[in-house]
Every structure is written in structure tokens, then in C-alpha cells.
């Protein structure tokens, strides 16, 4: 499975969105976990409402925020206030009773804000203002690599 | 009317190849998962494996893995399970049947096919 | 690999009587993930039960569900000559999708 790599300046936020297929997945509940090294598990950090119809509501931990919409078959996951410590591996998951299915990897690179360096005076940005999606916006990029880290539930 | 039906009974010889199938009419055959199930003479259900015919995502039960093939044909809404080896304890029935969905849920296995009798003798 | 025991193995009922079948997974299974089935000889299995406990199209109601997490029970209120075949249960909670070995219903 293809590894994507986002990359989002810290202090500001990181959206992900995750594509599917909205039939083969119906019903499923989806989540957004940390791998934990190449071999290791896969952490739930959020998944969806339990309510699989209720899933277009926003579900909260912590900073990450996570949000489906099942007929468009896109999850997108947003990691708001981004730090350093959030670099690392991620999947987004499909629930099915005990199994959780990978729909995508997610490689999340935390680039320091060189602004943090400076005095930057009226500069500043609200958080909820900056907002990065993927490859979208011109400071967040996006690519795809090859790695041989095994899906994990 | 949303139906599976099988193709017809096989009498084949060990060693031999086989493969059956299971046509569905009356639904949308991409979006729904099809799934295979065993039945020997005089016993129970045993799961075998389950594809979905849009994208033939396959899984299998680790009983059967190795041992069949389990396929699908979306141009033709057909799905198949063959042997290239078969044994005598292959003799049995075997039925397809669809795996229903609802809106946050499962439905089990909610369309059957009629089964498709296999008997392998010398 | 979650393994489903049925009991008892024969139910020997007369009609009108009340059956009571029973389900047990090794591990704990998610009730929308558990789903009852009636064969009669020589045919193909017919989806009873849902989600544990929510009625098939066509299914009357004299057939319910009940249980969660290891224990699922099937009754039938009251028995109709046309009831009396082998009943499976069977969890889609974790692949293998595994079926118990089937309560046969006869007739005392």
C-alpha cells in the first residue's frame, strides 16, 4: 500500500482526506490511528460516531479531529495545532465489527515555522484560520512512496 | 427479483479441475460482497471465503485458504469458486450467498443461491 | 478464529410449544454482528435474524432474537409445522465468518 506524505508548518493545522469506496464500506465506522514503529500496532487515536448516519459529525480527541461522509466516501481527518511530537506514521482505518481495513497511510512530516525565529508582530495567524488540505494549499505538500510497512488492526 | 443462481451438479474425479458458478439478477452485483459456504453430507455451515465483485477483494477462511480460488466476473455479474486439485472430501454442497448491508450495519448473508452439488469419486 | 457452539444439539418440540435455541462465541461478538439462519432438507438457508435480534423481510414474529457479547438465544414462541429444520448461528464480527453446528427443531 502507497504511503502519502503530508507535510504542515507546526502551530498551524493539517487536513487528511481519506477516499473510499462509499458502497463497499457501507455501514462501517472509520478511524484514524498511530503506528507505532514499522512492525508494531496501529493506536486508535478517533474513529467516527457510533452512529454510523451521524458520522458527518465532527468527533473530537484532543487536537484531531476526525469527520465522514459516507455517500461521497471521503473521511477527513484534521490535526489542529500541529507539534513536532505529531510527525510520524498514520492509517486511516474501516471498521467492520473486530476489523479494521487500511484504507490509506499516512506519512505526517511537521515543518517548523520559520517565523517562530522572528518576532512576528502582527503576522500572526489564528489557528482555526490556517488550515492546510494536503497538497492544496501552497506550504503542504504532498507525495506518495513506497513502504513495506504491513497493514495492522 | 434478487437472486443468485448456481450452475449445475458436478461429478468429477480426484485430481481433477472444477469451477462453479453463481450468476446475481435483480441487484446492483458490484456493491454487494458474495460469499461461499460448504456443506458436507449430513453436516453443518462452514464458511469458506467472501469477494467483492467491484474491486475482487477476497478473503478467505484459513480452512480453504490455498485450497480453492475464489473470483468474480463484474461484466457478466457472475462470482466463482474452483479447485485445480480436487479430493473426495471436496464432495459436497456448496451455495453462494450475498452479504446484505443496511445503513450502519450487517445483514448476514441474506440472498442465497440454490447450491451447487459436487461429488468427487473414483 | 471465533468458534460458535449451539445447543442443544435436537430440540424435540411438539408444535405450539415454545423453542428456545442458544448461541455461545468463544470470544465476545458485536451484536450487529450476529445473525440466525433456518435450512429445511434440501434447501438453502434462509436469513432469519439480524443484528442479533432484528427480524429478516418476510420473517413473521413469532421468531426473535436476543443476547450480546458471548450469549445469543433464537426463540420461536410458538411452533408452526413449518418450523421445525436445523438453525445456525453465525457471527461476521471477525473473519473467519465461523457458523455454529446447527440446532435440529423436531417434532416430539
Known amino acids: 500500500l502507497n504511503t502519502t506524505v503530508l507535510q504542515g508548518m507546526a502551530g498551524q493545522s493539517l487536513r487528511v482526506s481519506c477516499t473510499y469506496d462509499a458502497l463497499k464500506h457501507w455501514g462501517r465506522r472509520k478511524a484514524w490511528c498511530r503506528q507505532l514503529g514499522e512492525e508494531g500496532p496501529c493506536q486508535r487515536v478517533v474513529s467516527t460516531h457510533g452512529v454510523w448516519l451521524l458520522a458527518f459529525l465532527k468527533k473530537r480527541n484532543g487536537s484531531t479531529v476526525i469527520a465522514d461522509d459516507t455517500l461521497a466516501g471521503t473521511v477527513t481527518i484534521t490535526l489542529k495545532n500541529l507539534q513536532a511530537g505529531d510527525a510520524g506514521l498514520y492509517q486511516c482505518q474501516s471498521l467492520r465489527g473486530r476489523e479494521a481495513e487500511v484504507l490509506q497511510k499516512v506519512l505526517v512530516e511537521v515543518l517548523e515555522d520559520p517565523l517562530d525565529d522572528q518576532d512576528a508582530g502582527d503576522l500572526w495567524v489564528p489557528e482555526e484560520s490556517s488550515s492546510f488540505e494536503g497538497a492544496q494549499v501552497e506550504h503542504s505538500t504532498s507525495r506518495n512512496q513506497e513502504t513495506s510497512f504491513p497493514p495492522t488492526s | 427479483e434478487v437472486q443468485l443462481v448456481q450452475s449445475g451438479a458436478e461429478v468429477k474425479k480426484p485430481g481433477e479441475s472444477l469451477k462453479i458458478s453463481c450468476k446475481g439478477s435483480?441487484?446492483?452485483?458490484?456493491?454487494?460482497?458474495i460469499g461461499w459456504v460448504r456443506q458436507m453430507p449430513g453436516k453443518g455451515l462452514e464458511w469458506m471465503g467472501i469477494?467483492?465483485?467491484?474491486?475482487?477483494?477476497?478473503r478467505y477462511s484459513p480452512s480453504f485458504q490455498g485450497q480453492v480460488t475464489i473470483s468474480a466476473d463484474k461484466s457478466i455479474s457472475t462470482a466463482y469458486l474452483q479447485w485445480s486439485s480436487l479430493k473426495a472430501s471436496d464432495t459436497a454442497m456448496y451455495y453462494c450467498?450475498?452479504?446484505?448491508?443496511?445503513?450502519?450495519?450487517?445483514?448476514?448473508?441474506?440472498?442465497w443461491g440454490q447450491g451447487t452439488t459436487v461429488t468427487v469419486s473414483s | 478464529e471465533i468458534v460458535m457452539t449451539q445447543s442443544p444439539g435436537t430440540l424435540s418440540l411438539s408444535p405450539g410449544e415454545r423453542a428456545t435455541l442458544s448461541c455461545r462465541a468463544s470470544?465476545?461478538?458485536?451484536?450487529?454482528?450476529l445473525a440466525w439462519y433456518q435450512q429445511k432438507p434440501g434447501q438453502a438457508p434462509r436469513l432469519l435474524i439480524y443484528?442479533?435480534?432484528n427480524r429478516a423481510t418476510g420473517i413473521p414474529d413469532r421468531f426473535s432474537g436476543s443476547g450480546s457479547g458471548t450469549d445469543f438465544t433464537l426463540t420461536i414462541s410458538r411452533l408452526e409445522p413449518e418450523d421445525f429444520a436445523v438453525y445456525y448461528c453465525?457471527?461476521?464480527?471477525?473473519?473467519?465468518?465461523?457458523f455454529g453446528g446447527g440446532t435440529k427443531v423436531e417434532i416430539k
Open positions: 435483480g441487484y446492483s452485483f458490484t456493491t454487494y460482497w
Open positions: 469477494i467483492y465483485p467491484g474491486d475482487s477483494d477476497t
Open positions: 470470544q465476545s461478538v458485536s451484536s450487529s454482528y
Open positions: 453465525q457471527q461476521d464480527d471477525s473473519a473467519p465468518y465461523t
Open positions: 450467498a450475498r452479504a446484505g448491508h443496511y445503513d450502519g450495519g450487517h445483514l448476514g448473508m441474506d440472498v
Open positions: 443484528g442479533a435480534s
